[in-house]
Interface confidence: medium
């Protein structure tokens, strides 16, 4: 069967997100991938969306992230825009209303996004073959 258009959009967004550092891509998020052995794919997507939502809700107006130059400000706004898009698309793939996220292991946002990108690319290669 063909790959979901949402999946392609997620990979595209993740590629954009992981291309550049901002002042806040090194801030830390809950690492939902550390203990995801007994977790369904839909639960993983749901938890990933929850983590991203927590991040952008907390840091959208964080002065450290907005920076002090026009370039830093623009890059942060772009980061938040991409995270919101990713959040929306992940919810679409998950098809779940909510999911628990335990505050356990920590990962930087950039590492979290790289891990998510690997998972999504694997999923894409399976559905496109």
């Amino acid at each position: 069967h063909k790959c979901d258009i949402t999946l392609q959009e997620i990979i595209k967004t993740l590629n954009s997100l992981t291309e550049q550092k901002t002042l806040c891509t090194e801030l830390t998020v809950t690492d939902i991938f550390a203990a995801s052995k007994n977790t369904t794919e839909k639960e993983t997507f749901c938890r990933a969306a929850t983590v991203l939502r927590q991040f952008y809700s907390h840091h959208e107006k964080d002065t450290r992230c907005l920076g002090a130059t026009a370039q830093q400000f623009h890059r942060h706004k772009q980061l938040i825009r991409f995270l919101k898009r990713l959040d929306r698309n992940l919810w679409g793939l998950a098809g779940l209303n909510s999911c628990p996220v335990k505050e356990a292991n920590q990962s930087t946002l950039e590492n979290f996004l790289e891990r998510l990108k690997t998972i999504m690319r694997e999923k894409y290669s399976k559905c496109s073959s």
């Epitope: 550092k21 901002t22 891509t25 801030l27 991040f55 840091h59 830093q72 930087t108």
Partner: nanobody
Amino acid sequence: EVQLLESGGGLVQPGGSLRLSCAASGFTFRNFGMGWARQAPGKGLEWVSWIISSGTETYYADSVKGRFTISRDNSKNTLYLQMNSLRAEDTAVYYCAKSLGRFDYWGQGTLVTVSS
């Protein structure tokens, strides 16, 4: 366990300089953005400066821009804040911080008093 230990505070005259240090342990220092915040007597916490792991991106609050310089030595797990042209309004407890997303790890703080 994350530990952040600030030092270098003290009493200084207006126009003077101080260099704050923050010794970090309990985590891989070179992987994380770090920063300084301060709390003046009777006021809220204010972010002063922030630096990413590589040191290539920095943030400064408008109130300290051009006077303060943040830097880090990843080989020594140490964060620095060079403070020049100090003013009375810079008097505060200065905290070293490692942010964990919605959670921040803070040091105990070091007091900087600018007075003649």
